[in-house]
């Protein structure tokens, strides 16, 4: 299993759990059901993963290939500025918002979108693969 921070970069990834997709050096889980943002976060944490934290535009573009018009929760929140769940600021992409109550972040094939946090959406978890060491 991965050692250290959930948010660290993984080295070469031998395998991912069932129903998880391997992409690059990480495993991704695209949910079938829908939950609110907090429940989605808890789902990921319970599986030694975290709600998707996107590191750069390249990763975002690659993941969007697997997305539709439907929005998915990701590990992004607006708390005096948009920040990822690892504490880093959102600085490589813009997020669309139409209201002050939309403080949780979602993604679809068109980009990032703010949403009110209680609405049920699909979600994406991200984790290191099995038998791997985290790079710091």
């Amino acid at each position: 299993l991965c050692q250290g921070s959930n948010y660290s970069t993984c080295a070469s990834c031998p395998s991912c759990p069932d129903r998880w997709m391997k992409y690059g050096n990480h495993c991704y889980y695209f949910s079938v059901e829908e939950k609110d943002w907090n429940s989605s976060l808890e789902f990921c944490l319970a599986r030694d993963s975290h709600l998707l934290v996107i590191t750069d535009n390249q990763e975002m573009s690659l993941l969007q290939v697997f997305l539709s018009e439907a929005f998915c929760w990701i590990g992004l929140r607006n708390n005096s500025g948009w920040r990822w769940e690892d504490g880093s600021p959102l600085n490589f992409s813009r997020i669309s918002s139409n209201s002050f109550v939309q403080t949780c972040g979602a993604i679809n094939k068109n980009g990032l979108q703010a949403s009110s946090c209680e609405v049920p959406l699909h979600w994406v978890c991200k984790k290191c693969p099995f038998a791997d060491q985290a790079l710091f």
């Epitope: 918002s97 139409n98 209201s99 002050f100 109550v101 939309q102 703010a114 949403s115 946090c117 609405v119």
Partner: antibody
């Protein structure tokens, strides 16, 4: 028919407390965000607070944080505003309003109550 | 805070006249703007939401539009019940803020 009926207003001394209620009917209350807005004697409208449908998320202007608390009882279809440490500048007509939330789309304050008057004076 | 500068503060007009009220936003608010109507008894009603969408039951003589940071409410032909107060509301930024109001008076 959507109806919002505020109550609980009145005359209160500076430093005192008051709890306003807003009884909602004609729609599925728990599906909607709700807000409180006040109108000063000078006719200026000011946002006071907003709460999510499930009650898990609340929003306030910095100037009122800590003194005012918005809450709701979805079983009773009622919205509340607890006001404490009241000041003369809190004197206003207080309105509750319904907000339409569709997650990634949000439309503010589509229906308003008739208001309840709060006067803070010694 | 986002400032909403509403003009004019009062407007005298005649029945059947076309009038426009404007709100200027100090920051980008996209289309997150409502127009509200307030009767003399205090009753508040939303007329326009999301800049240009007409609420159900609102007469078609009311319309909303945007040009850059300027948002307008236009009444194409004034009727007697239109001579009341109007406010804009932006809800994109926190806190939501209102214009200072326009009093529409019969000339």
């Amino acid at each position: 028919e959507v109806q919002l009926v505020e109550s609980g207003g009145g005359l209160v001394k500076p430093g005192g407390s008051l709890k306003l209620s807003c009884a909602a009917s004609g729609f599925t209350f728990s599906n909607y965000y709700m807000s409180w807005v006040r109108q000063t004697p000078a006719k200026r409208l000011e946002w006071v607070a907003t709460i999510s449908g499930g009650g898990g998320y609340t929003f306030y202007p910095d100037s009122l944080k800590g003194r005012f608390t918005i809450s709701r009882d979805n079983a009773k279809n009622t919205l509340y505003l607890q006001m404490s440490s009241l000041r003369s500048e809190d004197t206003a007509m207080y309105y509750c309003a319904r907000d339409q939330d569709y997650g990634t789309i949000y439309y503010a304050m589509d229906y308003w109550g008739q208001g309840t008057s709060v006067t803070v004076s010694s | 805070d986002i400032q909403m500068t509403q003009s004019p503060s009062s407007l005298s007009a005649s029945l059947g006249e076309r009038v426009s009220l404007t709100c200027r936003a100090s920051q980008d608010i996209g289309s997150s703007l409502n127009w509200l109507q307030q009767e003399p008894d205090g009753t508040i009603k939303r007329l326009i939401y999301a800049t240009s969408s007409l609420d159900s039951g609102v007469p078609k003589r009311f319309s909303g539009s945007r040009s850059g940071s300027d948002y307008s409410l236009t009444i194409s032909s004034l009727e007697s019940e239109d001579f009341v107060d109007y406010y804009c509301l932006q809800y994109a930024g926190s806190p939501p803020t209102f214009g200072s109001g326009t009093k529409l008076e019969l000339k």
